[in-house]
């Protein structure tokens, strides 16, 4: 089918984009769509004494309900939406008047949709329309046995024994403009290494320090040993799963899918089939013996509520095939449209370097929030979140961590996946405004019950204070309950209280806690806050109180199912400008709850930022006397000295972002 | 846009000689593994050479192990095949393949080995 023409009647203005529909271009291409007009009732040369009304030109994107309009050019003049700076031109105008061809930059997958371009002249309007697909998916790939084993040959076959081939540059920038973040570093096709990190941390810094982009190694010696990214294309064909009660075994996932009319899938097929919506709550063998499962919809239950293509592991460090005695179900492939390169075709065999990739696509809605963490490129110890529990890698070993996979025996893991989403850095430099120095904060001292923020830790999470409102005491038992909820926690426990006290944490304000009791944790007894307790360090109760009268409650956040972010511009915020601001960058405010938790896990900033309460505060994980006072712990700024008061929502701050 | 554009097919007798051509654009050709495949009439693709993106390691089929020859020019995104002492059951559709998707090869190039 070629391009959709509409105009109201036939002697008026034609607008024609002389292309097929849909129009199929690989990721990290560029793409020029050609669109021409007629307009037989204007005609270009009109009297010198009058002033020619130039035709309008806008092209727009449609896609999932949603237009953009990406540029409009009238009188020789081009308007570029600003989100498409250096993305989208007239190649041809304003030197042919009449030529609104377009032309689109390092295509995403985002880029897909359906192109319209309008001509408005007078009173007339005209349009015709193209849809573009853009194809194909990066991925990283790492062979089974540990990180960084493969030079640029091994690596090359790792993707076309996969139904892939190496990525390109262009198409790893495009993926990261997807949203694409995995800290390992990896091969691509004109022989450099390169990776792509959206929220720069200690190891995965490279050549870039504190900013966002892809990192690079530059052009490296064929025989270094890195992972790879790859880069599947398309299929024509179809992956589906196989089962039976008992599951099968490598061979007989193999022989099932054969009677079946169809092969074991790839890797880059499955990809493929994940990136087309496909989801699949059980793990199967594919056809390089790794076992993995793709998951479009994130769920609790189903590889710790993350998307992408998970793998299952033998051991904890993530390494090691399932035996290929073990049962899981059969992804099959069927179509004619890839043929199996024989392993003497690279002039080995075996499985020395059969490979598994890591990673999770970001830039999908999720209805929760997202589990986000990362490995190193080059080695440190990963904090990560809500596993049903965890090891504390060495430094030799990949840095992920791993949660049950689902049907599983008890011996396999299910990666988590070595990714974090796009978030919004501080641009590079501190701004000025209100300096959590100068501002009253209070003196919370919120120790993480079971360990000190960059520490390896068990499970646990963090008992916090809350008064969410500008007035102390206020919170009846039931609004304490939904307080801690709306802040993305729950109320906390005497049992989790009493482990916070004992990992230091102090606070003398009464709070609600989970069996109606009500207690505050003292390290340190001074006069008004002795409590039941004397001069003795120790939780101090009120006992079970009526549910009708008011404190402040403790809240219990379990583990970050996200990635808090800070954000900035010059002029900061508003509280109104922060919601706005963060979801116009697929995320929200952060919830208090999510701010102590990424607190939990390392995220220190001596900038006071909005939260989703209307609360201002600040994390700080490494105290030094600027960054409000010597203990670590999440600063809160109140209006008044005794600590009361939220501050005004038209005063301009920083905020902090979830997503 | 990546294409692949095959040449040097032809009719030919036992015991001669073809060299296949393959002109490569739209992809970096120097970083990437090339390969000849070839698909005789009513039968499966089968796999013939493949070439490293250096050039420095290349490998055979055995059916046409010692006759055939894989050859690169990075220079000019060029692939080889040297073809000597052709047989009848050489006659095929003769594809340039850097992946394994059929649908990113080239159009192919007929070699018919006749007498």
């Known amino acids: 089918a070629v391009t959709v023409e509409t105009s109201d009647h036939d002697n008026s203005l034609s607008v024609s984009i002389p292309q097929p529909s849909p129009l199929r271009v690989l990721l990290g291409t560029s793409l020029t769509i050609p669109c021409y007009f007629i307009d037989p009732m204007h005609p270009v040369t009109t009297a010198p004494s009058t002033a020619p009304l130039a035709p309008r030109i806008k092209w727009s994107r449609v896609s999932k309900e949603k237009e953009v309009v990406l540029l409009v050019a009238t009188e020789g003049r081009v308007r570029v939406n600003s989100a498409y700076q250096d993305k989208v031109s007239l190649p041809n105008y304003p030197a042919i008047p009449s030529d609104a061809t377009l032309e689109v930059q390092s295509l995403r997958s985002n880029d897909s949709g359906v192109y319209r371009c309008e001509v408005m002249h007078g009173i007339e309007d005209s349009e015709a329309t193209l849809e573009v697909v853009v194809k194909g998916i990066v991925f990283h790939y790492r062979a089974i046995s540990t990180r960084y084993t493969l030079d640029f040959d091994r690596a090359q076959r790792a993707c076309l024994q996969n139904s892939a081939i190496i990525a390109t540059p262009e198409q790893l920038q495009a993926a990261y403009e997807d949203g694409f973040h995995q800290c390992d570093a990896g091969w691509l096709a004109d022989q450099t290494v390169r990776y792509p990190i959206h929220t720069p941390r200690e190891g995965c810094y490279g050549d870039k320090d504190e900013f966002p982009g892809v990192r690079t190694y530059g052009i490296r010696d064929t025989n270094e040993t890195y992972d790879v990214y790859c880069f599947a294309e398309e299929m024509e064909g179809e992956v589906f799963y196989a089962t039976s009660p008992e599951k099968f075994t490598f061979q007989e996932a193999a022989n099932e899918c054969r009677r079946l009319g169809a092969r074991l899938a790839t890797t880059g097929q499955l990809y493929l089939a994940w990136q087309a919506g496909m989801d699949m709550c059980s793990a199967g063998w594919l056809a390089d013996r790794s076992v993995r499962y793709p998951i479009s919809k994130a769920r609790p239950n189903c590889g710790g509520n993350l998307l992408g293509v998970r793998t299952v592991y033998v051991h904890a460090n993530q390494t090691g095939y399932p035996d290929p005695s073990s049962r899981y179900d059969a992804i099959c492939y069927t179509g004619e449209d890839f043929v199996d390169i024989p392993e003497n075709f690279f002039g080995v065999g075996g499985e020395e370097d059969i490979t598994v990739q890591t990673v999770t696509w970001p830039d999908m809605e999720l209805p929760l929030p997202r589990n986000i963490t990362e490995g190193e490129a080059r080695g440190s110890v990963i904090l990560t979140v809500k596993p049903i529990f965890e090891v504390s890698p060495s430094p030799l070993e990949p840095e992920e961590p791993f949660t049950f996979a689902p049907e599983i025996g008890a011996t396999a893991f299910a990666e988590v996946e070595n990714e974090t989403g796009e978030a919004t850095r501080p641009w590079g430099f501190p701004t000025p405004g209100l300096g959590p120095a100068t501002a009253f904060t209070s003196e919370d001292l919120v120790v993480q019950v079971t360990a000190v923020p960059g520490q390896p830790h068990l499970p646990g999470g963090v008992v916090f204070h809350y008064r969410p409102g500008p007035t102390r005491y206020s919170l009846t038992f039931e609004e304490a309950q939904q307080a801690c909820l709306r802040t993305g926690a729950v109320i906390a426990s005497p049992e989790q209280l009493q482990a916070a006290y004992e990992a230091g944490y102090e606070q003398c304000d009464a709070g609600w806690l989970r069996d109606q009791t009500v207690r505050y944790p003292i390290v340190s007894p001074r006069t008004p806050c002795v409590g039941d307790k004397d001069s003795s360090p120790g939780v101090r109760t009120y006992g079970v109180r009526p549910s009708t009268e008011t404190y402040d409650v403790y809240c219990f956040v379990d583990r970050l199912e996200g990635e808090v972010f800070f954000a900035t511009r010059l002029e900061q915020f508003t509280f109104q400008e922060a919601l706005e601001f963060c979801e116009s960058h697929n995320a929200t405010l952060a919830t208090t709850g999510q701010l102590y938790a990424a607190w939990s896990r390392g995220l220190d900033k001596c900038y006071a930022g909005w939260l989703a309460d209307g609360s201002l505060r600040y994390p700080i994980v490494t105290p030094r006397p600027a960054c409000g006072g010597d203990k670590p712990g999440v600063r809160t700024v109140y209006l008044y000295p005794n600590q009361t008061g939220l501050p005004d929502p038209l005063s301009r701050h920083h905020a902090f972002c979830f997503r | 846009e990546v294409q692949l554009v095959e040449s040097g097919g032809g009719l030919v007798q036992p015991g001669g000689s073809l060299r296949l051509s393959c002109s490569a654009s739209g992809f970096t050709f120097s970083g990437s593994w090339m390969f000849w495949v070839r698909q005789a009439p009513g039968k499966d693709y089968e796999w013939v050479a493949s070439?490293?993106?250096?050039?420095?390691?290349?490998y055979y089929d055995d059916s046409v192990k010692g006759r055939f020859t894989i050859s690169r020019d990075s220079a000019k995104n060029t692939l080889y095949l040297e073809m000597n002492n052709l047989k009848p059951e050489d006659t095929a559709l003769y594809f340039c393949?850097?992946?394994?998707?059929?649908?990113?090869w080239g159009q192919g190039t007929q070699v018919t080995v006749s007498s």
């Open positions: 393949a850097r992946s394994p998707r059929v649908g990113s």
């Open positions: 070439i490293n993106s250096s050039g420095g390691r290349t």
